[in-house]
């Protein structure tokens, strides 16, 4: 069932079918006997109650009140009252934009990012039963799609999808044709979730060892699911069998990014190597970024300011 | 409109320089890397390169090495890609594009390479 | 560098039958920390730049047909064009992004037969 009017202030466009459904309406029903009246009051004018004799635009169904369609001076405060129950709504009624197929300020904003499940469906569960056609329009252009009782569009959001939305339902009530447009501006942006992967820590580092000990350099990042993080060093990675890239460790952060390590372990040091340089380097589709390791043979220490050391 | 607008031809003799431009627009210029792509006459794709536009840095194929630079101006979104000591098997189409799996890709440059 | 190997050179198919190209990495472009292939398919018109058919081995670029389609994983890889159209005839690459310098095969050339 289609949910009460729970909104205190409604702005509606003039010209289409609308209706105001209170939100005690399942007490309404086991209250069958209890009398339940609408009112509205504009401006100076008291509370006037509402009743098909009203205007012939009106009509009461149970916990409905329908217009067809709703007009400019139907502006104005609703309210509903049942026993002790009370219901109000400010009600504001717009112009129709006469030169476009839809009005601005009945516009429903929303943002997708590119490459992101887009989708627009159009429904009207309210007035399904009576809808016997529905449009989508792209900027005040009928889209051409199979399904004409609901238009769909499902897919991965491309730049060129941004614009406006327009779902017009087309529906019969006594003999008459009414129309109800919901329209949406789509704005696509770039993918907002991805960040700059960072390599922590210092972008060269010296590190003193020994020969014949053993070294693990530890090269971490934070970044997204799809970004690589590796190393390279000589001429082909590989050559050495001293050296080996341990499996690569990620933990995810909070934020839902990547916080990875990948360790390069360096048995036996031998003077081969020795200051030469140890890349890690993690890339993305925004480009790379390395930090470089450099051994160093504990004895040459002094010749290094001590800042630059990593252990 | 999401785009990436390449310089106009070129004809370039042996042994000088040629500079190549593509200018970035609709998307924001420091989220993707900006790669170099040529194709010679009748042959395939040949990467040359890409620039990292947040932080500059730089990775270049290993033949090209010492003869190309790739930079980028970021009050311009725009990159550029410096070829020197053109030889004749320099002839061909340049192509910049977006990203690493390149999802944009300029019009193409063709610089012509003739004593 | 990692070598990227298409096969075959050159292939004629008939309009509306199933096209199938093959493109072979030297090493793994599959990356074990997040599960994801490094691996893109694009198609090349005479005079025009080539356009990203899919990514990540199998992901179809918005806007490409339903007909495209991408498998594989590791090091062996397959483009399939499920019913060929006219408009498909074209050079088709396939490319590495998982190390510098990111290599490409070097491209099938699709003709109708």
């Known amino acids: 069932a289609e949910s009460c009017t729970s909104r205190p202030h409604i702005t509606v466009v003039e010209g289409e079918p609308f209706y105001l459904k209170h939100c005690s309406c399942s007490l309404a029903h086991e209250i069958e006997t209890t009398t339940k009246s609408w009112y509205k009051s504009s401006g100076s004018q008291e509370h006037v109650e509402l009743n098909p004799r009203s205007s012939s635009r009106i009509a009461l169904h149970d916990c409905v009140l329908e217009f067809w369609p709703v007009e400019l001076n139907d502006t104005g405060s609703y309210f509903f009252q049942m026993k002790n129950y009370t219901q109000k709504w400010k009600l504001n009624v717009i112009r129709r934009n006469k030169h476009s197929c839809f009005t601005e300020r009945q516009v429903t904003s929303k943002i997708v990012e590119v490459k992101k499940f887009f989708q627009i469906t159009c429904e009207n569960s309210y007035y399904q039963t009576l809808v016997n056609s529905t449009s989508l329009y792209k900027n005040c252009k009928k889209l051409l799609l199979e399904n004409n009782k609901n238009p769909t569009i499902k897919k991965n959001a491309e730049f060129e999808d941004q614009g406006y939305y327009s779902c017009v339902h087309f529906l019969h009530h006594n003999g008459k044709l009414f129309n109800i447009t919901k329209t949406f501006n789509i704005t696509i942006v770039e993918d907002r979730s991805n960040i700059v992967p960072v390599l922590l820590g210092p972008k060269l580092n010296h590190v003193a060892v020994e020969l014949g000990k053993n070294v693990r350099l530890n090269c971490s990042a934070l970044l997204n699911e799809e970004d690589v993080i590796y190393w390279m060093f000589g001429e082909e990675n590989g050559s050495d069998p001293n050296i080996h890239e341990e499996k690569e460790m990620r933990i995810m952060t909070p934020e839902g990014k990547w916080h990875a390590s990948k360790v390069l372990r360096i048995e036996n040091i031998g003077e081969s190597n020795l200051n030469v340089l140890y890349n890690c380097t993690v890339a993305s589709t925004g480009g790379t970024d390395t930090k470089s390791f450099i051994l160093v043979r504990k004895a040459d220490m002094a010749d290094i300011p001590g800042h630059v050391f990593t252990r | 409109q999401v785009q990436l607008v390449q310089s106009g031809a070129e004809v370039k003799k042996p042994g000088a320089s040629v500079k190549v431009s593509c200018k970035a627009s609709g998307y924001t210029f420091t989220s993707y890397g900006i790669s170099w792509v040529r194709q010679a006459p009748g042959q395939g794709l040949e990467w040359m390169g890409w620039i990292s536009v947040y932080n500059g840095n730089t990775n270049y194929a290993q033949k090209l090495q010492g003869r190309v630079t790739m930079t980028t101006d970021t009050s311009t979104s725009t990159a550029y890609m410096e070829l020197r000591s053109l030889r004749s098997d320099d002839t061909a189409v340049y192509y910049c594009?977006?990203?690493?799996?390149?999802?944009?890709w300029g019009r193409g440059t063709l610089v012509t390479v003739s004593s | 560098d990692i070598v990227m190997t298409q096969s075959p050179d050159s292939l004629a198919v008939s309009l509306g039958e199933r096209a199938t190209i093959n493109c072979k990495s030297s090493?793994?472009?599959?990356?074990?920390?997040?599960?994801?292939?490094?691996l893109a398919w694009y198609q090349q018109k005479p005079g025009q730049p080539p356009k990203l058919l899919i990514y990540?081995?199998?992901t179809r670029e918005s806007g490409v047909p339903d007909r495209f389609s991408g498998s594989g994983s590791g090091t062996d890889f397959t483009l399939t064009i499920s019913s060929l159209q006219a408009e498909d005839v074209a050079v088709y690459y396939c490319?590495?992004?998982?190390?510098?310098?990111?290599?490409f095969g070097q491209g099938t050339k699709l003709e109708i037969k």
């Open positions: 090493q793994t472009v599959l990356y074990s920390s997040n599960n994801k292939t490094y």
């Open positions: 490319q590495q992004y998982y190390r510098t310098p990111y290599t």
């Open positions: 990540w081995a199998s």
């Open positions: 594009a977006r990203g690493w799996y390149f999802d944009l």
